[in-house]
């Protein structure tokens, strides 16, 4: 469910949303590190109805979210990272 | 005291529609995501929808999907079930339910239920 | 789709004494399981939620535990009040429930 992604593209997100919403509705998470041509973190949430939102990363439970899935990943599996270069 | 009152329940033949409401109270609706739930004629508990609480996001399971549209009116306190294209297998007992709160960020689940609104589908 | 397999469906137990249920997930759901007592005529309660976090209001007599994919959820002290329909549901990945357990006064 968590993914990062490095991207040398602009920002994704226009606009960020710090709706909360619970992890049985979320498909996947997408988070872009700042830097290259991005002054800012981004995540994207894919939900389970299809739509995709970008979350302000500084909103207390997606902080809350990731802390948990770094947790357990490192405790079992590792985290899927895709790393994407554009030149 | 928080209350769920559902209504419009009924004998609608199969292909025919139905809209049930659900009248909230002793608590701030707009504050809370909120679902359907049914209970077939084998006791058994199935979810149907559930809309965010303010009302941009549902979300359905693939059988009820495409039938059945989940809405609300936080000025009025009431949540909606459209349900459409009704099937033998949709006859239940329908349930409302609140679900989490929209400003938290806690897992909880469904926490208060109605006393539920009867559906038959037949010929 | 995640399938919640309860145990046993039906029981019966004298007064004062205790009852476990069981309900296993076909995948791990991450201790997001919750329990519902269902009488005839009303809603379901919500006993417990994320495993073993009683709501409020709920005797301690009821409780539960469990990881991964199995959990279980115990009522000891039987009190004639108890005597219902009990459900789990996993809110991990959307919802299912599992497929009840009645339990009745011996």
């Known amino acids: 469910v968590l993914e990062v992604y490095y991207t040398s593209l602009r920002c994704r997100c226009v606009q960020e949303s710090s709706v909360f919403i619970p992890r049985r509705f979320i498909d996947r998470i997408q988070i872009l590190p700042r830097g290259n041509g991005c002054p800012r973190k981004e995540i994207i949430v894919w939900k389970k109805n299809k739509s995709i939102v970008c979350v302000d990363p500084q909103a207390e439970w997606i902080q809350r979210m990731m802390e948990v899935l770094r947790k357990r990943s490192s405790s079992t599996l590792p985290v899927p990272v895709f790393k994407r270069k554009i030149p | 005291e928080v209350q769920l009152v559902e209504s419009g329940g009924g004998l609608v033949k199969p292909g025919g529609s139905l809209k049930l409401s659900c009248a909230a109270s002793g608590f701030t609706f707009s504050s809370y995501a909120m679902s359907w739930v049914r209970q077939t004629p084998e006791k058994r508990l199935e979810w149907v929808a559930t809309?965010?609480?303010?009302?941009?996001?549902?979300y359905y399971p693939d059988n009820v999907k495409g039938r059945f549209t989940i809405s609300r009116d936080n000025a009025k306190n009431n949540l909606y079930l459209q349900m459409s294209h009704l099937k033998s297998e949709d006859t239940a007992m329908y349930y409302c339910?609140?679900?989490?709160?929209?400003?938290?960020?806690?897992?909880?689940?469904?926490?208060?239920w109605g006393q539920g609104t009867s559906v038959t589908v037949s010929s | 789709d995640i399938q919640m397999t309860q145990s046993p469906s039906s029981l019966s137990a004298s007064l004062g004494g205790k009852v476990t249920i069981t309900c296993k997930a076909s995948q791990d759901i991450n201790k997001y399981i919750a329990w519902y007592q269902h009488k005839p005529g009303k809603g379901p309660r919500l006993l417990i939620h994320y495993t073993s976090t009683l709501q409020p209001g709920i005797p301690s007599r009821f409780s539960g535990s469990g990881s991964g994919r199995d959990y279980s959820f115990s009522i000891s002290n039987l009190e004639p009040e108890d005597f219902a329909t009990y459900y789990c549901?996993?809110?991990?990945?959307?919802?299912?429930f599992g497929g009840g357990t009645k339990l009745e006064i011996k």
């Open positions: 339910a609140r679900d989490y709160y929209g400003s938290g960020y806690e897992d909880s689940p469904m926490d208060y």
């Open positions: 549901l996993q809110y991990d990945n959307l919802y299912t």
């Open positions: 809309i965010s609480d303010g009302g941009s996001d549902a």
